[in-house]
Amino acid sequence: ESGYAQNGDLEDAELDDYSFSCYSQLEVNGSQHSLTCAFEDPDVNITNLEFEICGALVEVKCLNFRKLQEIYFIETKKFLLIGKSNICVKVGEKSLTCKKIDLTTIVKPEAPFDLSVVYREGANDFVVTFNTSHLQKKYVKVLMHDVAYRQEKDENKWTHVNLSSTKLTLLQRKLQPAAMYEIKVRSIPDHYFKGFWSEWSPSYYFRTPEINNSSGEMDPI
């Protein structure tokens, strides 16, 4: 699908002092959706500040956010999911800044989980598998995944592979022998819905076999 901007681009707020960003999570708790907003500047005094969303809601005109420490949060079934909502920072009845946002364009998927790597001796490869709660969802079902892996000693030398399935094969010859690797995965919406990368899954660590001197192949772990 054609897009207008990079995934996750958000509008500037009217007043820089109160600039904020939000992300939505659909069916995050059964059929309930959530919307989370926070100020860009962690030093903003949030004591009397509230967030409100109006428009593109079912049965109600507006909803107020709950404040949870530095973040503002709504969990509801009342998002229409079509049309733009107006999200405002308020002090009492006065709006300080507002953004028109379509909640389907700021979706942040849940992090993948159950990441594992299995070495196949006969095939000389590693099968990477992971799970995602989105396979069971009705809205954000189609995701693009980013698998990142690195040799543990290479601090910032990550190799990334994008895939739409939850299974990836890494060829043994592409990896260093007798090395410890770290691997992790994250997801982003990939059909109709737009938004942000999920949090990374917990990392999984695996060791590649030694090279077998006689055959030039790696020994199994």
């Epitope: 699908e1 207008y4 681009d9 229409l80 999911l81 049309g83 733009k84 028109k100 364009t105």
Partner: antibody, heavy 118, light 111 residues
Framework: QVQLVQSGAEVKKPGASVKVSCKAS????????LHWVRQAPGQGLEWMGG????????AYNQKFKGKVTLTSDRSTSTVYMELSSLRSEDTAVYYC???????????WGQGTTVTVSS | DIVLTQSPDSLAVSLGERATINCRTS??????????MHWYQQKPGQPPKLLIY???NLESGVPDRFSGSGSETDFTLTISSLQAEDVAVYYC?????????FGGGTKVEIK
Amino acid sequence: QVQLVQSGAEVKKPGASVKVSCKASGYRFTDYELHWVRQAPGQGLEWMGGIDPKTGGTAYNQKFKGKVTLTSDRSTSTVYMELSSLRSEDTAVYYCARSGGRWYFDVWGQGTTVTVSS
Amino acid sequence: DIVLTQSPDSLAVSLGERATINCRTSESVSIHLLHLMHWYQQKPGQPPKLLIYGASNLESGVPDRFSGSGSETDFTLTISSLQAEDVAVYYCQQSIKDPYTFGGGTKVEIK
């Protein structure tokens, strides 16, 4: 009130270009994407493309890529559609339309008739 | 491209009677309960006017004699009691996939 006002009718020769404007008022210009839809004489509606005035990002119907260029000017709350290499089949009414959501059109300009004739 | 087929091409209905227009799509335009189908009214010499968005949501200011229903590939626009001012061409439009396509239109007249 919310309004989209388009520039006037144009008569052009084949091979020429035309630039149609659409001035928005009554709302914050950067809040909504603006699209262009054409209607050939006696025909239906055809989506050509859209622009996000906030970022300048564009999306085009593949059919019109290379034919249409969309731009916007935030200082005047105006979007422009330029049609190049005009042919007689480009004769149509061209509408700009605001996208109230993804992607339906809740406010329309009055239309600009472009006639291509030698 | 997703093809939208409207039926009938034209419709003559008595004043005060019900008018029903159908729109069938070549593939689903629904994601669960999110139905990406919209309806417009166009009178001669005027731009189209949004009536219904998201299959069943009435646009602000549109009379409630207009209603929409449907899901997946089959959608309906209903005018419950036709008024003289409803004479127009009606178009459906999908927005699940670029390019966003319109139906061919249904002309509604008074019988």
